[in-house]
């Protein structure tokens, strides 16, 4: 149930390998910075995606069934107390906005999480259960394919995924309040 997921995310992550990141060939990563969007809108070039009409129950189900497990696997070998949660969200569309931004927008020290399994599943669940979201991803996907990546592990990516876990937990909690 929900409590099991919450407890699994509170306890110390089991031992294992750290997360990986894909960085540009010049090793500098990307200069794009992560910004907060409290409106529930995601900037995609000139297009803003509004998460208001998503099927939140279906997204919750996908998260609890599979995405949460991949996030925890990524964090294996670290303690949940290793990182402080600095990113928050106030409602379901805002939580999805922050989750989308943190998962797919490159940051200086964690260039891309987009190839990770949890990210691929996040993209799939948003594409499936958020009307019109897939259309906004067509050009973004084509642009991403043109960038050659190589894997590097960074502590900053672990911190970013820790923030993602917190955002997803917040998303579930805001969903519970509504029911």
């Amino acid at each position: 149930g929900l409590n099991d997921i919450f407890e699994a995310q509170k306890i110390e992550w089991h031992e294992g390998g750290g997360g990986s990141d894909y960085k540009d060939d010049d090793d500098k990563g990307s200069s794009h910075h992560h910004h907060h969007h409290s409106s529930g809108l995601v900037p995609r070039g000139s297009h803003m995606y509004d998460f208001t009409n998503c099927d939140f129950q279906k997204i919750e189900a996908d998260y609890l069934r599979t995405i949460s497990k991949d996030l925890i696997t990524y964090m294996s070998g670290t303690k949940s107390t290793d990182f402080n949660n600095t990113v928050s969200c106030s409602n379901r569309p805002h939580c999805l906005t922050e989750i989308q931004s943190l998962t797919f927008n490159p940051t200086p020290r964690c260039a891309s999480l987009a190839k990770e399994m949890f990210a691929r599943k996040t993209k799939a669940t948003l594409a499936l259960w958020c009307p019109g979201y897939s259309e906004t991803q067509i050009n973004a996907t084509q642009a991403m394919k043109k960038r050659r990546k190589r894997k590097v592990t960074t502590n900053k990516c672990l911190e970013q995924v820790s923030q993602l876990l917190g955002l997803w937990r917040r998303f579930i909690r805001t969903l519970l309040k509504k029911q």
Partner: antibody
């Protein structure tokens, strides 16, 4: 190359069930959802539902909810569509079609179709 | 459920002519419309996706346009192999739906 090969034609009695298979090859099975679409004789295309292997989840057209079950065996890259409580109106060609769930997002490859005839 | 209305039901044209097929959605669906061609006894074949995106291997005489609720598939110069039924489909939200089709027949 991408191929979706469906099982052969079926003749069924009213009230019985049919299970149609769709064997995928030439691509990574979990990168795509498998949709099922039917076409009754001389009629339009009707979306029945989908199974998303990446997320282990499915979604159905309400018109078929309770009667249609869509599953997949990831180890053999095969999707299945089972339709129960068959009636004569279910006589149709049933198609499987793949759709990317992390890219493309469109039904870009289709099976050859499976004719299911429901007759007493 | 989003309803897609295609018009005309049948289009009678000669080879070399221009074909304009319409698809209207019952609500705003941005550009989440795809076009398929179907010939008798065959599975549908994808022609255009997300209103105007072209598919490799599809002749460039096929083009799509539109957004919101009104969409158009244009065949600039009809070839003999283009006489078939054309369907629009929306993937904006579940349940996915198809239009009733436009039959392009030889005049």
């Amino acid at each position: 190359q991408v191929q979706l090969v469906q099982s052969g034609p079926e003749v069924k009695k009213p009230g019985s069930s049919v299970k149609v298979s769709c064997k995928a090859s030439g691509y990574i099975f979990t990168d795509y959802a498998m949709h099922w679409v039917r076409q009754r004789p001389g009629q339009d295309l009707e979306w029945m539902g989908t199974f998303i292997p990446l997320l282990d989840t499915s979604d159905y057209n309400q018109n078929f909810k309770g009667r249609a079950t869509i599953t997949a065996d990831k180890s053999t890259s095969t999707a299945y569509m089972e339709l129960s409580s068959l009636r004569s109106e279910d006589t149709a060609v049933y198609y499987c079609a793949r759709m990317g769930v992390t890219h493309s997002y469109v039904m870009d490859a289709w099976g050859q179709g499976t004719l299911v005839t429901v007759s007493s | 459920e989003i309803v897609l209305t295609q018009s005309p039901g049948t289009l009678s044209l000669s080879p070399g002519e221009r074909a304009t097929l319409s698809c209207r959605a019952s609500q705003h669906i941005s550009r989440s419309v795809h076009w398929y061609q179907q010939k008798p006894g065959e599975a549908p074949r994808l022609l255009i996706y997300f209103a105007s995106q072209s598919i490799s291997g599809i002749p460039d005489r096929f083009s799509g346009s539109g957004s919101g609720t009104d969409f158009t598939l244009t065949i600039s110069r009809l070839e003999s192999e283009d006489f078939a039924v054309y369907y629009c489909q929306q993937s904006y939200s579940f349940p996915y739906t198809f239009g009733r089709g436009t039959k392009v027949e030889i005049k």
